[in-house]
Amino acid sequence: ITQQDLAPQQRVAPQQKRSSPSEGLCPPGHHISEDGRDCISCKYGQDYSTHWNDLLFCLRCTRCDSGEVELSPCTTTRNTVCQCEEGTFREEDSPEMCRKCRTGCPRGMVKVGDCTPWSDIECVHKESGTKHSGEAPAVEETVTSSPGTPASPCSLSG
């Protein structure tokens, strides 16, 4: 995922509407001019701002990586929402890339949770019911998992 960054400031194009700040702040979908006197609209599909703010530049829209699907496009008030493709997932502690879900559980374990865009399949020990740590198993059973149906975005929104 492309990191949030400042969109380069350009001369105000005709379509970029100006308005006056309220209490020194500009509404979502706008940024403030350097002198603090004007609110300038973000450019649809290019940059955005989600809150009342005094940013000198709107934030650059995220572009979904290959291996991701775009759940919703970037608007002037909300960043793009990207999600891992079916059969892959993104963990909170490694949000930079989608990883392939395991196709099955190690011997002696059973699957209790499907692959979703935000989690790998979940395996527990048959007897104790304790969870597997999540490392790729050395030997896998033939039991395969079907990818979970995407329900909500696992990646960033504004």
Epitope: Q4, L6, P21, S22, E23, G24, L25, P27, I32, D35, G36, T50, H51, W52, N53, D54, L55, L56, F57, L59
Partner: nanobody
Framework: EVQLLESGGGLVQPGGSLRLSCAAS????????VGWFRQAPGKGREFVSA????????YYADSVKGRFTISRDNSKNTVYLQMNSLRPEDTAVYYC???????????????????WGQGTLVTVSS
Amino acid sequence: EVQLLESGGGLVQPGGSLRLSCAASGRTFGSIRVGWFRQAPGKGREFVSAINRNDGTTYYADSVKGRFTISRDNSKNTVYLQMNSLRPEDTAVYYCAAGLQYNRSADRVPVGAVYWGQGTLVTVSS
């Protein structure tokens, strides 16, 4: 890319003082207001103070009013937080923040920020 670097944290006795600095590199602070938040062990991040770099208007959380003073030196691209009469409950990691975010224009307390420093630890203990 906006980068914020805090310094000045350390161990101080109750009643003592510290001055924190926040320097911006790259494309300055990226916003007109710059603020300080803090996060005490096991607690959420809370707003401390903010300053408007254009006109010097300042904002403070009730818990630090009269004890902390925020200031700026635009020529050095730096914002300072002078902390006096420090108390044990001021112990926290202090974060410099820019691109402060508000739910409403009339709000004095931001709900978050776009840009954050790495934080500097302030410990108030005897």
